[in-house]
């Protein structure tokens, strides 16, 4: 099958960077400049992806593959092969439609992108806040009431002062 | 080919006006919210302002908020920016850029981004 599609259609021994030509008696022709063919047997070549504004160029375009752009500092890449970039912000922040915005009381971003998420709930695990959350930080659970023995809390009290000189009883 | 094309930039005085446009082309506008950002000398990318499908939701950098206003003519297929009481601090290149598919809704990212168009503050 693969012999007989050959002999019928002059087009499929056309390699990758190269289109079939059909203003040429189907001669197979190079990629013109800027556009690539990535695969054999194609009628037409793709024209290249331009990085550009906050796009950088990862990788330049070749007559055989497309160009990849990444992000330029200060944004970072979503959707396949890079397709947008969006804005960072700062921790303790989130990206809204109206810039990046600080997070609410209860809530936190450690990274510079995502949203703000809720602090976590210690009592819904029988634990008590060991660390106050922030708006870059989560709060720290500590142990549960429980787990503490009777009339003990959680912060150590201090040693009892003593005399200097004197050793403990 | 999806394109996006800014013109107006230039050298204007402080506490001058200027006006800016992004026209469109390759895609329908109207379907997508459009953006403004700018890079001034030596700086980062800055978001500038944006505006949804229909004109009625407009945003603003606090740095611009006031002096500065975008708008749209989606039968022209443009968007603009009016910049009044320019400072040299807004010396920058100006680019537009389409918001991608979903945005406000999933993601604040763009696809789309023009050349820029370079403006100039100074006496």
């Known amino acids: 099958f693969e012999r007989t599609r050959s002999l019928q259609d002059p087009c499929s021994n056309c390699p990758a960077g190269t289109f079939c030509d059909n203003n040429r008696n189907q001669i197979c022709s190079p990629c013109p400049p800027n556009s690539f063919s990535s695969a054999g047997g194609q009628r037409t070549c793709d024209i290249c992806r331009q990085c550009k504004g906050v796009f950088r160029t990862r990788k330049e375009c070749s007559s055989t593959s497309n160009a990849e752009c990444d992000c330029t500092p200060g944004f970072h890449c979503l959707g396949a092969g890079c397709s947008m970039c969006e804005q960072d912000c700062k921790q303790g922040q989130e990206l809204t439609k109206k810039g990046c915005k600080d997070c609410c009381f209860g809530t936190f971003n450690d990274q510079k992108r995502g949203i703000c998420r809720p602090w976590t709930n210690c009592s819904l695990d029988g634990k008590s806040v060991l660390v106050n959350g922030t708006k870059e930080r989560d709060v720290v659970c500590g142990p549960s009431p429980a787990d503490l023995s009777p009339g003990a809390s959680s912060v150590t009290p201090p040693a009892p002062a003593r005399e200097p000189g004197h050793s403990p009883q | 080919e999806v394109q996006l094309v800014e013109s107006g930039g230039g050298l204007v005085q402080p506490g001058g006006s200027l006006r800016l446009s992004c026209g469109a082309s390759g895609f329908t506008f109207s379907s997508y919210w459009m953006l403004w950002f700018r890079q001034a000398p030596g700086k980062g990318l800055e978001w500038v302002a944006n505006?949804?499908?229909?004109?009625?939701?407009?945003y603003y950098v606090d740095s611009v908020k006031g002096r500065f206003t975008i708008s749209r003519d989606n039968a022209k297929n443009s968007l603009y920016l009016q910049m009044n009481t320019l400072r040299a601090e807004d010396t920058a290149i100006y680019y537009c850029?389409?918001?991608?598919?979903?945005?406000?809704?999933?993601?604040?990212?763009?696809?789309?981004w023009g050349q820029g168009t370079t403006v100039t503050v100074s006496s």
């Open positions: 505006i949804n499908q229909d004109g009625s939701e407009k």
């Open positions: 850029a389409r918001g991608g598919d979903g945005y406000s809704d999933s993601h604040f990212g763009t696809d789309v």
